[in-house]
């Protein structure tokens, strides 16, 4: 009985989110394998949240726009081991927007879930930012590692998505 | 006072090449970004070129890619637009334009008189 | 690439009166409550001169006269009152996005 009300309440979830996802990939974890955790297909996961990949050209006010679209934001980096993850997913030659910016060119980072920037936690490449115009963050390879780099917000790049894990 | 003063213009050939100048004076050339905007006769305004400040980025339209280069020497303070294989429909007054950065984007703030190029044979 | 639309392409305004330009982009050139459209007066035989930026802000040695308003993809600028050395084409231009583009132009006369 237990287990068919909560089979009952999965499968209501699961139509709510149809709606925005229509394909949701799930995993089961927790201390008794109870819970589901999914990500829209087909975005890739890692710890408490869902990744995708955007290979459009767009500006970062426009990738912003079209990750909220999706229940998302730009991607937020906390940690090396997260961005050590994203980047096994990423083309060396290709730049991806992040979602940090700095729009009054103060040198005021701020990333668009309102995270504090914090400095000891980022992940600049050497010499970098550079410049009060370039107002928005990608991240790139360059000199042999992943690191972020400060550009245009105008110019088209590709970029990164991020959003909270569903719970079912 | 910025001053921005464009020289080069001409009448040349279809297919033929030109060279224009802009000469800047009254603020710190290296720190904007600059671009070249033309306009045709009796037509409105057309984005050509833009080159960053530290000379990293540029970008054209297609109408003009692989025809046209823009660069900078900011020694000289001095921006160029190099125009090979130059069309009929390239004719126009080309501005050189200061760009100023705001939030996510920019707006030119300050124009050259322009100088004129004719294409035609 | 982002079309900017302007209407009217002319219109007469006798001195004193208001003229109202409209500029429409095919998509929204706002972000978080910054507007980027900006206006530019061009006189005949005259390179462009920045009226007003981010939609709203006057550009510094602008008279009063000139305001301009809108967001999202549907901007404004008016000339209230307007003065006889007001005739000239006037430009709306986008920069969320490269490429930067420019309307149509308006061209306003004065009666």
């Known amino acids: 009985n237990f287990m068919y009300s909560k089979t009952v309440k999965r499968l209501s979830k699961l139509q709510e989110y149809q709606q925005y996802y229509p394909s949701l990939t799930c995993v089961m974890e927790g201390k008794d394998m109870e819970d589901w955790s999914c990500c829209p297909t087909p975005w890739t996961s890692f710890q408490s949240s869902c990744y995708f990949i955007s290979t459009v050209m767009q500006s970062w006010t426009k990738s912003q726009n079209n990750c909220s679209v999706m229940g998302a934001d730009l991607v937020v980096i906390n940690t090396k081991e997260e961005q050590d993850f994203i980047t096994q997913n990423l083309k060396i030659n290709s730049a991806y927007f992040l979602g940090l910016s700095d729009p009054k060119g103060w040198r005021h980072w701020q990333w668009v879930d309102q995270t504090p920037y914090n400095k000891n936690v980022t992940f600049w490449h050497s010499g970098e930012p550079n410049s009060p115009d370039e107002r928005c963050a990608i991240i790139n390879f360059r000199s042999e590692e992943w690191g972020w780099n400060d550009v245009h917000c105008h110019v088209p790049q590709k970029s990164i998505c991020k959003m909270k894990k569903i719970y079912i | 006072e910025v001053q921005l003063v464009e020289s080069g213009g001409g009448l040349v050939k279809p297919g033929g090449s030109l060279r224009l100048s802009c000469a800047a004076s009254g603020f710190t050339f290296s720190s904007y970004g600059m671009s070249w905007v033309r306009q045709a006769p009796g037509k409105g305004l057309e984005w050509v070129s833009t080159?960053?400040?530290?000379?990293?980025?540029?970008y054209y339209p297609d109408s003009v890619k692989g025809r046209f280069t823009i660069s900078r020497d900011n020694a000289k303070n001095s921006l160029y637009l190099q125009m090979n294989s130059l069309r009929a429909e390239d004719t126009a007054v080309y501005y050189c334009?200061?760009?100023?950065?705001?939030?996510?984007?920019?707006?030119?703030?300050?124009w050259g008189q322009g100088t004129t190029v004719t294409v035609s044979s | 690439d982002i079309v900017l639309t302007q209407s009217p392409a002319s219109l007469a305004v006798s001195p004193g009166q208001r003229a109202t330009i409209t500029c429409r982009a095919s998509e929204s050139v706002s972000f978080h409550g910054t507007h980027l459209m900006h206006w530019y007066q061009q006189k005949p035989g005259q390179p462009p001169k920045l009226l007003i930026y981010a939609a709203s802000n006057l550009e510094s040695g602008v008279p009063a006269r000139f305001s301009g308003s809108g967001s999202g993809t549907d901007f404004t600028l008016t000339i209230n009152p307007v003065e006889a050395n007001d005739a000239a084409n006037y430009y709306c231009q986008q920069s969320i996005e490269d490429p930067p583009t420019f309307g149509g132009g308006t061209k306003v006369e004065i009666k």
């Open positions: 334009a200061r760009q100023l950065y705001y939030s996510y984007g920019y707006y030119f703030d300050y």
């Open positions: 080159i960053s400040s530290g000379d990293s980025y540029t």
